[in-house]
């Protein structure tokens, strides 16, 4: 039994780091393998992650962490019974993939303005709470070409756009994702999308 693709890990910078790797053949990850992780820190203990299958030869492990700070560095040991298959390290702050924003809502009752709001996925005491920026994707269900991205570079989890910038009388969907420049993170996954029917009063034309 050998590791074909070494584990690569990303952290949500809160409580979970996810590591993925590939074996050289079909493997029952949960029964045959264990990933041990230990913070390089005084009096820390080793913790065990039981991997799950991720395709025939692929494995994925969700490492639970109490919290994360920038100095944290973990040793990783991948074991098959008594055999050490791979040894490595992982610094969560250098491989951050933020959590996806949630509770995306479109408020259509604000005159002819669309107000999109969502929730910051982090609690206020987490470092990323005040460092997230967002991208909002809006698209038409009827017209695949009607697809737009709004970059929200301020901290408030909301976006206002004029309803008239979208076509009237058709359905739109929106979703939002996050990233943090401070840790040069990857983008989060997209939030679940929300749907609304866009309608607004056409401005009265005077002849």
């Amino acid at each position: 039994m050998k590791v074909l693709q070494e584990p690569t890990c990303v952290s949500d910078y809160m409580s979970i780091s996810t590591c993925e790797w590939k074996m050289n053949g079909p493997t029952n990850c949960s029964t045959e393998l264990r990933l041990l992780y230990q913070l390089v820190f005084l009096l820390s203990e080793a913790h065990t992650c039981i991997p799950e299958n991720n395709g025939g030869a692929g494995c994925v492990c969700h490492l639970l962490m109490d919290d994360v700070v920038s100095a944290d560095n973990y040793t990783l040991d991948l074991w098959a019974g008594q055999q050490l298959l791979w040894k490595g390290s992982f610094k969560p702050s250098e491989h951050v993939k933020p959590r996806a924003p949630g509770n995306l809502t479109v408020h259509t009752n604000v005159s002819d303005t669309l107000l999109l709001t969502w929730s910051n996925p982090y609690p206020p005491d987490n470092y990323l709470y005040n460092h997230l920026t967002y991208a909002v994707n809006i698209w038409s269900e009827n017209d695949p070409a009607d697809f737009r991205i709004y970059n929200v570079t301020y901290l408030e989890p909301s976006l206002r756009i004029a309803a008239s910038t979208l076509k009237s009388g058709i359905s739109y969907r929106a979703r939002v994702r996050a990233w943090a420049q401070c840790y040069n993170t990857t983008w989060s996954e997209w939030s679940p999308s929300t749907k609304w029917h866009n309608s607004y009063r056409e401005p009265f034309e005077q002849h």
């Epitope: 992780y37 913070l39 820190f41 005084l42 009096l43 820390s44 203990e45 080793a46 913790h47 639970l64 962490m65 109490d66 919290d67 700070v69 920038s70 100095a71 944290d72 470092y127």
Partner: antibody
């Protein structure tokens, strides 16, 4: 009530051995790292040794390395310090103290928040 | 090893007056933002040491609010806003970021 009670101190000749015990109660003993600190007569405090909650990781002051062994029996909620090849400079009051919560991925630290009453070790011929 | 240096080593104080003890470490005790592994202990005559402050600024359970800790990196301070007679004893700072844990020499607080 959270409590630590040391025992095992006494008078021993240079080169001799003693085993100190520290019984913990009122907290989940196995979840916490434990530490020994000593104080020579009229002197300040000196760290001696620490052990993680499971007993896997141990740490020693250079002055006792190779002579002292820290261990624990979590089934008995007891911490030990086996002291061999004793020297006159090991004469001190020995305290055990409750250290950080080591079951967390980053051990949660609340200081050495509980101390025993101390047990006196005298090394003299 | 990290060297801890306390000052003053002797501190005579009038009851009701404030008192301040400084502790300097030979290297930073800041593991990461908000985690400065520096404690303050009080040892009264004939007693075991007792924890006053942990992680530089967190008051231990049951410690009167006249005691406060501050500082980060290498410079730390213990303040007593109004000294009481029961506060006499030796005050020690201690770092627990790295082994060996190291203590300051101790500051003897006495009533004038």
């Amino acid at each position: 009530e959270v409590q630590l009670v040391e025992s095992g101190g006494g008078l021993e000749q240079p080169g001799g051995s003693l085993r100190l015990s520290c019984a913990g109660s009122g907290f989940t003993f196995r979840d916490y790292a434990m530490t020994w600190v000593r104080q020579a007569p009229g002197k300040g405090l000196e760290w001696v040794s620490s052990i993680s909650g499971s007993g896997t990781n141990t740490y020693y002051a250079d002055s006792v390395k190779g002579r002292f062994t820290i261990s624990r029996d979590n089934s008995k909620n007891t911490l030990y310090l086996q002291m061999n090849s004793l020297r006159a400079e090991d004469t001190a009051v020995y305290y055990c103290a409750k250290d950080r919560l080591s079951v967390s991925t980053r051990p949660k630290y609340y200081g050495l928040d509980v101390w025993g009453q101390g047990t006196t070790v005298t090394v003299s011929s | 090893d990290i060297v801890m240096t306390q000052s003053p080593l002797s501190l005579p104080v009038t009851p009701g007056e404030p008192a301040s003890i400084s502790c300097r470490s030979s290297q930073s005790l800041d593991y990461s933002y908000g985690y400065n592994y520096l404690d303050w202990y009080l040892q009264k005559s004939g007693q075991s040491p007792q924890l006053l402050i942990y992680l530089a600024s967190n008051r231990a359970s049951g410690v009167p609010d006249r005691f406060s800790g501050s500082g980060s990196g290498t410079d730390f301070t213990l303040k007593i806003s109004r000294v009481e007679a029961e506060d006499v004893g030796f005050y020690y700072c201690m770092q627990s970021l790295h082994t060996p844990y190291t203590f300051g020499q101790g500051t003897k607080l006495e009533i004038k």
